[in-house]
């Protein structure tokens, strides 16, 4: 299973649920569905209040039980480490895959943290992070921001990912804007 890691803003906007949580238990495999579930302890929710309604406490995260079908395998054994988890809701359950954005909270830049807590949501409705994977690539719309991190640095952990968000400048126009300057 291979996928291009998304820009964190794309992960935020395309997810039903974005939370901060600790992985606290040994994964269990369901003998019927062949999905495994990880027990988590949610510490913060950044997106999904409306989708969840009253059931605002997520206790488990679900993923296919094998790597070849995009299952997520949690390698950290540190049960006190917090992770940012961006996933999809299916039948009221939080699902993630290899392609989901799951990262240690401490590994995120201050700008990314600001993005998840406040700023990425501003760009969700109108703006699109457009990956540039090979030259030439050009903007297809004024609401697109060209994401060149992978092209220039061979990594999704480049400058645009760590420090910028694609936000509305004016109606019909989105541009890369620094998240640094917005950090209190």
């Amino acid at each position: 299973c291979t996928c291009v890691p998304p820009h964190p803003q794309t992960a935020f906007c395309n997810s039903d649920l974005v939370i901060r949580a600790k992985f606290v238990g040994t994964p269990e495999v369901n003998q019927t569905t062949l999905y495994q579930r990880y027990e988590i302890k949610m510490t913060k929710m950044y997106k999904g209040f409306q989708a969840l309604g009253d059931a605002a406490d997520i206790r488990f995260v679900y993923t296919p039980a094998m790597e070849s079908v995009c299952g997520y395998f949690h390698r950290s054994h540190n049960r006190s480490e917090e992770f940012l988890i961006a996933g999809k809701l299916q039948d009221g359950l939080l699902h993630i895959t290899t392609c989901s954005f799951v990262a240690p909270w401490n590994s995120l830049s201050l700008a990314q943290r600001r993005g998840f807590t406040k700023t990425y949501t501003v760009g969700c409705e109108e703006c699109t992070v457009f990956p540039c994977l090979s030259i030439p690539c050009k903007l297809q719309s004024g609401t697109h921001c060209l994401w060149t991190d992978q092209l220039l640095q061979g990594s999704e952990k480049g400058f645009q990912s760590r420090h910028l968000a694609c936000l509305p400048r004016e109606p019909g126009l989105c541009t890369w804007q620094s998240l640094r300057s917005q950090i209190a």
Partner: antibody, heavy 114, light 111 residues
């Protein structure tokens, strides 16, 4: 009680095909994932393929990927393994197993030889 | 392609205790509590003796016990009896390969 009965084994030439069946009884078939496991003569056990209860998730060992196809018919309580492009190294007793392998059948012998 | 490492053979006298080890990685034995042990007599299908690391199916003697520490699981048979002579296989759930087995251990009951 739980029962798994394999059938369909036999002698087949290299490059040939065979379809194994596993008839299940004594439990709610659709509530369990199922697997095929094989054992070559005098050798150890090797997991071959697995399928979820609803047939949505399907897994294969690298050694059979692209040649074998696992499927199930929950209305007939039956698990299948379609084996194509058979090789001499596929010779083994094939077992079907329930869930995370708590119950096994008695096995069916597949011999690939010219 | 054996995924889990077991000793090829172990032996013991009637009444003794023996332990068979099964070593894997953090993506199989170490990462999940899904280790099983099977007993196989010649020409027979494998029989489940231990599941989920340390649980015994009904009908299996309490002389059989299982445990796990890190990436290594163990099967202990106490009060060894002649009928325990067989091949023993460990098996674990594995995230990369779904289900993996050890190469098998031949248990010989001496005398």
């Amino acid at each position: 009680q739980v029962q798994l009965v394999e059938s369909g084994g036999g002698l087949v030439q290299p490059g040939g095909s065979l379809r194994l069946s596993c008839a299940a009884s004594g439990f709610t078939f659709s509530s369990y994932a199922m697997s095929w496991v094989r054992q070559a003569p005098g050798k150890g056990l090797e997991w071959v393929s697995g399928i979820s209860g609803n047939g949505v998730l399907i897994f294969y060992a690298d050694s059979v990927k692209g040649r074998f196809t696992i499927s199930r018919d929950n209305s007939k309580n039956t698990l299948y393994l379609q084996m194509n492009s058979l090789r001499a190294e596929d010779t083994a007793v094939y077992y079907c197993a329930r869930g995370l392998m708590d119950y096994w059948g008695q096995g069916t012998l597949v011999t690939v030889s010219s | 392609d054996i995924a889990l490492t077991q000793p090829a053979s172990v032996s013991g006298s009637p009444g003794q205790s023996i332990t068979i080890s099964c070593t894997g990685t953090s993506s199989d034995v170490g990462g999940y509590n899904y280790v099983s042990w099977y007993q196989q007599h010649p020409g027979k299908a494998p029989k489940l003796m231990i599941y989920d690391v340390s649980n015994r199916p009904s009908g299996v003697s309490n002389r059989f016990s299982g445990s796990k520490s890190g990436n290594t699981a163990s099967l202990t048979i106490s009060g060894l009896q002649a009928e325990d002579e067989a091949d023993y296989y460990c098996q674990s759930y594995d995230f990369v390969r779904f289900m993996v087995f050890g190469g098998g251990t031949k248990l010989t009951v001496l005398g």
